[in-house]
């Protein structure tokens, strides 16, 4: 098959409103530059400065800088996954790329040309994938996870996930890997999604799917997009394995009732 499982509806991070900002600790006293925390973070933290190690899951590089593997890095993908990139001058990166790239192709070939490729700066939209950082002493976020609901980081052990409730019964879930397989598919999807959200440089504006799970890790019968202001989110009904049930949807004008199904 072309793919394994679906992402489902989009759930965006909570806005950085006054309540969220009130929960922030004071920003570090000595900082060359303050930037927002990675992921859904609303609070301010120190930007990484030129020459500091960086990667997909570390804090952001400062303005005008871009995280890149060192030029002589034999395993550039691995370097970024492991937080062994370096914050370098973004314009220098562009100049180097222009120097290294072949001449632009002839007109008519442009649709798949090198020139069409987005340069993917640190400000590009993203939600990341492979979470690991080699050396905790270089990466203060090594033992933290982004909390979606309140938009701030919470201490946890190694990569043990600390969930907060987001209309999902996550509080009683243990994240120990030995117990993980005892839970249903919704729980596994949620944990994998939250793993994606750890140690991010930036947040995808398209958001991330956080499914609505019951305590056993199966899908609750009613799944909804979040409300947008006064506009109610789109809702639909699923079975315990997350498969949508035909005929049970609402465009927001009226509530959807998911009858004769598993636990809500």
């Amino acid at each position: 098959g072309a793919s394994s499982a679906g992402l489902g509806p989009v759930v965006r991070c909570e806005p950085c409103d006054a309540r969220a900002l009130a929960q922030c600790a004071p920003p570090p006293a000595v900082c060359a530059e303050l930037v927002r925390e990675p992921g859904c973070g609303c609070c301010l933290t120190c930007a990484l400065s030129e020459g500091q190690p960086c990667g997909i899951y570390t804090e952001r590089c400062g303005s005008g800088l871009r995280c890149q593997p060192s030029p002589d890095e034999a395993r550039p993908l691995q370097a970024l996954l492991d937080g062994r990139g370096l914050c370098v001058n973004a314009s220098a990166v562009s100049r180097l790329r222009a120097y290294l790239l072949p001449a632009p192709p002839a007109p008519g070939n442009a649709s798949e040309s090198e020139e069409d490729r987005s340069a993917g700066s640190v400000e590009s939209p993203s939600v990341s994938s492979t979470h690991r950082v080699s050396d905790p002493k270089f990466h203060p976020l090594h033992s933290k996870i982004i909390i979606i609901k309140k938009g701030h980081a919470k201490d946890s052990q190694r990569y043990k996930v600390d969930y907060e409730s987001q209309s999902t019964d996550t509080q009683n879930f243990s994240s120990e890997s030995k117990r993980e397989t005892e839970y249903g598919p919704c729980r596994r999807e949620m944990e994998d999604t939250l793993n994606h959200l750890k140690f991010l440089n930036v947040l995808s504006p398209r958001g991330v799917h956080i499914p609505n799970c019951d305590k056993k890790g199966f899908y609750k019968k009613k799944q909804c997009r979040p409300s947008k202001g006064r506009k109610r989110g789109f809702c639909w009904c699923v079975d315990k394995y997350g498969q949508p049930l035909p005929g049970y949807t609402t465009k927001g004008k009226e509530d959807v009732h998911c009858y004769s199904m598993q636990s809500k």
Partner: antibody, heavy 118, light 112 residues
């Protein structure tokens, strides 16, 4: 529903190049490692290389270095794999795959058969 | 690069019976964060591979609980508690610890 949709089968002559596309839909693209994996007839899986669009960073398997180029167009969420100086032994099904949360390929394209024949 | 060696290469199975596949790595796949970066895939005839197990023991979404993974360091095992007819195909282990990511040679599982 996350889907990786690949371009159609190709028949190429030895020494020529082929460019296969992989369009991602329904999910997030920018910081996943989009990889290319190939499978010769009756053989196993071989990782060819990958790209992280957000960092515009690529890495290739050593045996293919210099012949393979992986690029992306983030505006269309499409990854491309170009293989040059084709040889008979490059005849294979080429898959694009997205590395998920913990260095595993959670989504695969349907595969593109590239036949190198004179 | 890390070399993965699977055994057996061919495994005739009887539906309802258990089955086991081994994957040995040329170096430890245990990361300093405590995770073993070893994944298992099943490629059914004529299809793309599909993820079964990641991080040595975590079942991917939608994978039946008859599949389980175990092991740490260099030795890993995929077990099927009760083989079903739909489980036939080629099983691959893959390491995601370091690039280049590499696969085992594959184990062909077919019914007797």
């Amino acid at each position: 529903q996350v889907q990786l949709q690949q371009s159609g089968a190709e028949v190429k002559k030895p020494g020529s190049s082929v460019k296969v596309s992989c369009k991602a839909s329904g999910g997030i693209f920018s910081t996943y490692v989009t990889s290319w994996v190939r499978q010769a007839p009756g053989q196993g899986l071989e990782w060819m290389g990958g790209i992280i669009p957000m960092f515009d960073t690529t890495e290739y398997a050593q045996k293919l270095e210099g012949r393979v180029t992986i690029t992306v167009d983030e505006s269309t969420n499409t990854a491309y794999m170009e293989l040059s100086s084709l040889r008979f032994e490059d005849t294979a099904v080429y898959y694009c795959a997205r590395a998920g949360g913990l260095s595993h390929f959670d989504y695969w394209g349907q595969g593109t058969l590239v036949t190198v024949s004179s | 690069e890390i070399v993965l060696t699977q055994s057996p290469l061919s495994l005739p199975v009887t539906p309802g019976e258990p089955a086991s596949i081994s994957c040995r790595s040329s170096q430890s796949l245990l990361h300093s964060n405590g995770n073993n970066y070893l994944n298992w895939y099943l490629q059914k005839p004529g299809q793309s591979p599909q993820l079964l197990i990641y991080l040595s023991s975590r079942r991917a979404s939608g994978v039946p609980d008859r599949f389980s993974g175990s092991g740490s360091g260099t030795d890993f095992t995929l077990k099927i508690s009760r083989v079903e007819a739909e489980d036939v195909g080629v099983y691959y282990c893959m390491q995601g610890l370091q690039t280049p990511w590499t696969f085992g040679q594959g184990t062909k599982v077919e019914t007797k």
